[in-house]
């Protein structure tokens, strides 16, 4: 619900957004995701930091853990054991990479109202979790895995070979965390807690990235991370499973890798438990167009895991890489052998398929010139998923229910007509057996979270409606936003345009292109945001545009895989094409056009500035990739193949920013990077700067000492203030 626009006399009381509003997070929104603990109960941390249990059916709630207890150990997070006897309290949070962090853990006994003393957990712990049933604990400390049958028991050590930067047990190394698993953990309990599966990553032979961390000491520290760049030696992964009831009996048993995968370099991509004695592993060849899903069974007689070839399912792409960003994971049905999975159909759109015996005999469940995006839950009679089908807007997300108990299966859109103007981009969170679910709407209006009955889809209550935000925005002149498409040479380019509040088509406005453009990304989404570009439109009178070109997601494989083995070409072309179309619209001042982006967007903005079109007056690249030889193997090779003569070295060399140094001569370029960027290494910007200096091309630069890829904290304020000055100067806007 965007605040209604007021006119005439009241317009004087309205004010534009300020940069301060953005940097202070004045107009940030809240979401409500229930922490489900059963079919009808969830936990939530109240405003005063008590942990409260809500029972939907009785309508009653009560506190299970007081803020006093939380505060006594400075806890910032908690986790209830499934048997409801204990809570772990997490404190001393210390961030490592994108998902990983270490913390101190305390176990609180709810029955006695006191902390468990004796056999306390070591510190800091890298990962800790309860078993899915009861109150067993698995945790990772110093790269080794430990098991406790009960919180007060002494630990049983499962692995012994863990070594910093060498062997990782139960947690991923850098590249698996960032580019494959997207988690801080690499261990998985079986559904009833009988078995614990875990990954071991051996990084012994991986080259190390080293950079200085300046800190406050006399000498800087050197940070060393095993980080495989494109073409380098990769981690060696093995999967083990241990019986947690009798862990010392036979010890961890290795799960065999499918022969067709093991014949060359490969990755492990995910593990899904089906039952306590059946597990599903997904593997991927290093050349990431072949994925194998392997279903393995426990053999009681040998105490080993057997993965018959008949239970191997191959997924192969002939036009690009396997999957979207990641290979999708299966959602098993109640028979514990058949499953639902999203992959490309014969028309090149990602859709839900039902696999009972072989992939070749898969039954297609959804179809159309749109894409199924996520399978949330499969119950005995329903499958809940999200897609961008509704009204043919790829940047929307609605939740659908397919009845799988009846034939033919019927489909119902659960969200399409709930709050049609306000809510067009949803996600969902389901309780056990999908008895209830929460819907979280991200926009385009002010976000709202609601609770629903899983059988009737009736709304039970509003969990969070951001009333304070709505009131705060009542006197703000927000920019107007529109999402439309351009049809160019059989390519559909969706764009979002953010227009100044008093936009007048007969006037000329400076244009800023904000680009990301990475493979399988999507920037044009129907979501709410009050951010830096909202301020630039509201206060500084700029038009901002975001364009989804070739390589972006959820519009079919033709668009997605167009960039395969050719990064840095079509993404840039499509931004340029869109700019030309925007100029034709008549309200853009073609002498004042800029482009900016971060990460992959910094790469694209740099290439666009160096395209020699003369379209851009200036631009900004924040933490850009400058050569694909500098970036992580798992990500880069997925889209580019290997940087070898007999593979794709030529395009690796042709697609660098440095190769275009000469072309920056006629643009104003601002290059920005954090010196402690573990992800896109400072090396990338250092090489751009060197090439520009060598070409005697003037440019502006800003580094952020000891900052990573996110440029967080005080750096954020400095960054956006600095970029604002740069753009205002470029567009001749007074300060």
């Amino acid at each position: 619900l965007r605040p209604s626009r007021v006119h005439n006399s009241e317009e004087n009381t309205m004010r534009a957004l300020t940069l301060k509003d953005i940097l202070n997070g004045t107009f940030s929104y809240k979401t409500f995701f229930p922490n489900w603990i059963s079919g009808q109960e969830y936990l939530h941390q109240s405003a005063d930091n008590n942990i409260v249990l809500y029972n939907i059916e009785t309508g009653q709630s009560y506190t299970i853990l007081s803020n006093r207890t939380m505060k006594s150990v400075n806890a910032s997070n908690y986790g209830l054991s499934p048997d409801r006897q204990f809570v772990y309290l997490e404190s001393d949070y210390s961030k490592l990479w994108r998902y990983s962090y270490t913390a101190t853990y305390y176990i609180y006994d709810l029955s006695n109202g006191e902390f468990v003393r004796g056999n306390e957990l070591p510190r800091p712990i890298q990962y800790l979790c309860w078993s899915p049933v009861g109150s067993k604990l698995a945790y990772v400390y110093q790269n080794n895995i430990y098991l406790k049958q009960r919180p007060g028991d002494p630990p049983f050590q499962i692995t012994f070979n863990g070594r910093e930067n060498k062997i990782f047990n139960g947690i991923p190394d850098w590249v698996y965390e960032e580019e494959m698993l997207a988690t801080k953990y690499a261990l998985w309990w079986s559904p009833n807690g009988k078995f614990l599966a875990y990954a071991e990553f051996n990084d012994t032979d991986i080259p190390v990235i080293a950079y200085s961390y300046y800190g406050d000491e006399q000498y800087p520290r050197t940070i060393n991370i095993p980080y495989p760049k494109a073409g380098a030696k990769n981690p060696v992964v093995r999967i083990f499973i241990i019986d947690t009831t009798y862990p010392a009996y036979v010890g961890p048993q290795e799960v065999p890798v499918p022969a067709m995968i093991a014949s060359s370099d490969y990755y492990f991509s995910w593990l899904t438990w089906v039952t306590d004695e059946r597990v599903c592993l997904q593997w991927l060849k290093r050349v990431q167009n072949v994925s194998v899903l392997s279903i393995c069974d426990f053999r009681e007689d040998w105490q080993t895991w057997d993965c018959p070839k008949t239970q191997e399912h191959i997924e192969e792409s002939r036009t690009g890489w396997a999957g979207g960003f990641f290979v999708s994971t299966p959602v098993f049905s109640y028979d514990a052998i058949s499953y639902y999975k999203i992959f490309s159909d014969k028309d090149g759109y990602k859709h839900i398929h039902y696999i009972k015996d072989t992939v070749e005999n898969a039954i297609q469940i959804t179809s159309g010139k749109w894409e199924a995006i996520n399978i949330f839950r499969v119950t005995q009679d329903s499958l809940f998923y999200s897609s961008n089908e509704f009204e043919e807007y790829p940047g929307r997300r609605n939740i659908y229910r397919i009845s799988i108990g009846s034939y033919p299966p019927s489909k119902k859109c659960v969200t399409c007509h709930l709050r049609k103007e306000r809510c067009q981009y949803y996600t969902a969170s389901f309780s056990d057996y999908a008895k209830y679910y929460a819907l979280v709407c991200y926009g385009p209006g002010i976000p709202i979270s609601t609770l629903h009955d899983g059988r009737t889809d009736q709304e039970i209550k509003i969990l969070e409606e951001n009333k304070e935000l709505e009131n705060a925005l009542k006197n703000i002149q927000l920019p107007k936003e529109e999402i439309k498409k351009l049809e160019v040479d059989e390519i559909t380019l969706w764009y979002k345009m953010i227009l100044p509040p008093q936009f007048d088509r007969s006037k000329k406005y400076p244009l800023l292109i904000q680009v990301y453009g990475g493979p399988c990304s999507q920037s044009v989404r129907s979501v709410f945001a009050v951010n830096w570009i909202s301020y630039l439109a509201s206060k500084e009178g700029m038009v901002i545009a975001l364009v989804d070109g070739r390589g972006t997601a959820f519009q079919g494989d033709k668009l997605l895989y167009a960039v395969y083995r050719k990064l840095g070409v079509y993404e840039v072309e499509d931004q340029i094409t869109a700019v030309r179309k925007f100029i034709e619209m008549g309200f853009i001042d073609e002498k004042r056009i800029a482009i900016w982006g971060w990460s992959y967007g910094g790469y694209v903005s740099s290439l666009a500035l160096a395209s020699g079109t003369g379209l851009f007056k200036c631009g900004i690249a924040v933490a850009p990739v400058s050569s694909w030889e500098y970036y992580a193997s798992v990500y880069t090779e997925r889209f580019m193949g290997l940087p070898t003569k007999d593979d794709n070295l030529e395009h690796y060399k042709n697609s660098t920013v440095m190769a275009r140094a000469e072309y920056f001569r006629n643009v104003d370029y601002l290059l920005i990077h954090g010196t402690a960027d573990d992800n896109v290494h400072f090396q990338n910007s250092a090489q751009i700067a060197k090439a520009l200096v060598n070409a005697q091309v003037d440019f502006q630069a800003m580094w952020y000492s000891d900052q990573n890829h996110g440029l967080s904290g005080l750096s954020t304020n400095h960054l956006y203030t600095h970029m604002t000055h740069f753009l205002k100067q470029c567009f001749s806007l007074s300060d």
Epitope: S38, G39, Q40, E41, N50, L53, N55, E57, T58, G59, Q60, Y62, T63, I64, L65, S66, L80, R84, Q85, L110, S111, G113, K435
Partner: nanobody, 119 residues
Framework: QVQLQESGGGLVQAGGSLRLSCTAS????????MAWYRQAPGKRRELVAG???????NYVDSVKGRFTISRDNAKNTVYLQMNSLRPEDTAVYYC?????????????WGQGTQVTVSS
Amino acid sequence: QVQLQESGGGLVQAGGSLRLSCTASGTFSGRNAMAWYRQAPGKRRELVAGIRSDDSTNYVDSVKGRFTISRDNAKNTVYLQMNSLRPEDTAVYYCNLWPPVIGAGFGSWGQGTQVTVSS
């Protein structure tokens, strides 16, 4: 204000049976997740059995197959049927929400009911 009243304890010989009852009064709904807990002399209180709103149950290993938790929503009452009792089952038995409630109006445990199993 909500009160929980446990009853049904007593002295019983090993191998015998007892049925404990717990009745909730006040605004409380008996359909909340409920549990039986026990505390043996000199030991910490521990969970014995729990029953969720959907009537699914949980038992600690030591009582599995011997104890049964059940409820009567109409009477706001939770029961614990204890069979094949052993001397080590001797304790004060309490009922409470599962997990137990803390805080105003419901913050303390009831008196409990004493179960003594003689050998």
